[in-house]
């Protein structure tokens, strides 16, 4: 029986050009974690494997850094980074646990937001 639960950072927002840490935490299980995958929709961002360590997908190498812990740091954010991110914990004997994070990347400064909503 799968007793574990995944706690995530939930729905988060960050500014364009900035960085954000995506984090998931598996608890309430003694199952052995063998690998953690990070995915954006259907794209693989990174893998942390017990024996092989971290692998960052080549297309994200310049903008993704592993850590802290099993988290993932996304840098130089663009509006295109808005969307769903998934952490997938592969465990034995429980199986797979999945956590979901929604990231919204906002246009940069508060001043810009203010200007956009000025009354003519």
């Amino acid at each position: 029986m799968m007793t574990g639960t995944i706690e995530t950072t939930g729905n988060i927002s960050a500014e364009k050009g900035g960085s954000i840490i995506l984090q998931c935490h598996l608890s309430s299980t003694t199952a052995q974690v063998t690998q953690v995958n990070w995915e954006q929709q259907d794209q693989l961002l990174a893998i942390c494997n017990a024996d092989l360590g971290w692998h960052i997908s080549p297309s994200f190498k310049d903008r993704v850094a592993p850590g802290p812990g099993l988290g993932l740091t996304l840098q130089s954010l663009t509006v295109n980074d808005t969307g769903e991110y998934f952490c997938i914990y592969h465990t034995y004997p429980d199986g797979t646990y999945t956590g979901r994070i929604f990231l919204e990347v906002l246009e940069s400064s508060v001043a810009e937001h203010g200007a956009r909503f000025q009354i003519p």
Epitope: H25, S27, V33, D51, L52, W54, P66, G67, P68
Partner: antibody, heavy 117, light 107 residues
Amino acid sequence: QVQLQQPGSELVRPGASVKLSCKASGYTFTSFWMHWVKQRHGQGLEWIGNIYPGSGTTNFDEKFKSKVTLTVDTSSSTAFMHLSSLTSEDSAVYYCTREGLYAFDQWGQGTTLTVSS
Amino acid sequence: DIVLTQSPATLSVTPGDSVSLSCRASQSIRSSLHWFQQKSHESPRLLITYASQSISGIPSRFSGSGSGTDFTLSINSLETEDFGVYFCQQSNTWPYTFGGGTKLEIK
């Protein structure tokens, strides 16, 4: 098997600098964070900082930022910690430790640094 | 920075006893808490990772529990080889930090 090899000891003069090494073997060096930890005689453990050899990314405890430089040589799978402007407060055992899926799962034997005139 | 407070600082026990060591974080670190054992003149050794995950090669008498700010390392039926200092460490945020340690000594 995974090993982190560190020199047993270093003796340096106050005011000088030293470069401590940590040679990794038995795994893909560029895929695991390497951390450095300080332990003064009979005291607790202090996290100094880390480096990801795959990119050179570093993080430091603020306390050590002006004292420490972390580098790697991927061709020899070796991590280095450069300590500058040494004082007696820097006398300690310095460990390198690897972080992967299971946190700090491998440790070096530690280098005992003695700062003395 | 996240401060980890371990208690008690020293624990005097007899082989065969069972003990619980506490580690409290100054803010939530979810499950990003690890336990180490260090014997005199040796490097630390990882016992439990991510609060409750066991490590291959570590005796089953060691177990971990907790989440958020309160964590416990339990050792069932202590053996003489278990005496030493135990440290907790968090990897939730940089800078990583260690607790001050609990010394387990023979009564």
